[in-house]
């Protein structure tokens, strides 16, 4: 039975140019993390192996940066990044969680963030 | 350049056990996860173990799961596979295997190791 | 366990010859694929990886590319040194899972 609950970030904002830290944390369940992967939409930004490290897409490389920990930093963004990001845990035995954040990537310098997110 | 060899390969019996040894040279053991592939006789191939850069940190298959065990001695520049309760399907050419850098897929090799099994 | 079926299973071309071998994921992997050139006696040699990137030092006869759960691999101008087993991997999910390969030579 799948007992674990994936924590994120929510509903963020961001400045256009700056960056953001996009965080999932998986608990209540004692399943092993094996693999997170970071989704946008339908693209694959990121895998992080939990033994064979992280590994950015070609086509995210130059504006995406792995961390802290499992989390991921989108850098340079642009309105085009505004849209929905998912964090795929794949665990054993428990099977896949996934997490959702929503970021909005506002032209204004007004940007209101939402609270700061932090792993236990 | 980055070169690996397996060693410990032979004939083992069912129920048995082996343990295989893969030894690095050319980079920064310590720095790297690694893995154990193996291939059966005119067969694909399969993962069957990954750990991760100081070891605390494994993996196996549901093929393997409580029968192998993946170790390593950073100070050695050595990696390990345990292989207990062997089966006659386990009957295969063993290779270790790293990731290159920043390139998902096992860019380097070693030349492999056979391991039979049977009565 | 996502399975990665390659077809053909074998595929026999003339020299020059452009081939393809395709490689269907019983999941979408989002471009998280991996193709191996295995020859006979050998390991297998990394050739593209993010499904269509070539590693280091790899021809520009061969190129990958697919997204989905459909990939391929295509070696354009078929040499009599590509006669080997292809191989594709799937990275997206644990377990990284092979295609059972498929089997290149020369008529």
């Known amino acids: 039975m799948m007992t674990g609950t994936i924590e994120t970030t929510g509903n963020i904002s961001a400045e256009k140019g700056g960056s953001i830290i996009l965080q999932c944390h998986l608990s209540s369940t004692t399943a092993q993390v094996t693999q997170v992967n970071w989704e946008q939409q339908d693209q694959l930004l990121a895998i992080c192996n939990a033994d064979l490290g992280w590994h950015i897409s070609p086509s995210f490389k130059d504006r995406v940066a792995p961390g802290p920990g499992l989390g991921l930093t989108l850098q340079s963004l642009t309105v085009n990044d505004t849209g929905e990001y998912f964090c795929i845990y794949h665990t054993y035995p428990d099977g896949t969680y996934t997490g959702r954040i929503f970021l909005e990537v506002l032209e204004s310098s007004v940007a209101e963030h939402g609270a700061r997110f932090q792993i236990p | 350049q980055v070169q690996l060899q397996e060693s410990g390969g032979e004939l083992g019996k069912p129920g048995g056990s082996l343990r295989l040894s893969c030894a690095a040279s050319?980079?920064?053991?310590?720095?790297?996860?690694m893995s154990w592939v193996r291939q059966a006789p005119g067969k694909g191939l399969e993962l069957v173990a990954t750990i991760n850069s100081n070891g605390g940190s494994t993996y196996y298959p549901d093929s393997v799961k409580g029968r192998f065990t993946i170790s390593r001695d950073n100070s050695k520049n050595t990696l390990y596979l345990q292989m207990d309760s062997l089966r006659a399907e386990d009957t295969a050419v063993y290779y270790c295997?790293?990731?290159?850098?920043?390139?998902?897929?096992?860019?380097?090799w070693g030349q492999g190791t056979l391991v039979t099994v049977s009565s | 366990d996502i399975q990665m079926t390659q077809s053909p299973s074998t595929l026999s071309a003339f020299v020059g010859d452009t081939i393809t071998i395709t490689c269907k994921a019983s999941?979408?992997?989002?471009?998280?694929v991996s193709w191996y050139q295995q020859k006979p006696g050998q390991p297998p040699k990394l050739l593209i990886y993010?499904?269509?990137t070539r590693h280091t030092g790899v021809p520009d006869r061969f190129s990958g590319s697919g997204s989905g759960t459909d990939y391929t691999l295509t070696i354009s101008s078929l040499q009599a040194e590509d006669v080997a087993v292809y191989y594709c991997?799937?990275?997206?999910?644990?377990?990284?899972?092979f295609g059972q390969g498929t089997k290149v030579d020369i008529k």
């Open positions: 991997q799937q990275h997206y999910s644990t377990p990284w899972t």
């Open positions: 295997a790293r990731l290159g850098t920043g390139t998902l897929g096992f860019a380097y």
């Open positions: 999941q979408d992997v989002k471009t998280a």
């Open positions: 993010w499904a269509s």
């Open positions: 050319g980079f920064t053991f310590s720095s790297y996860g």
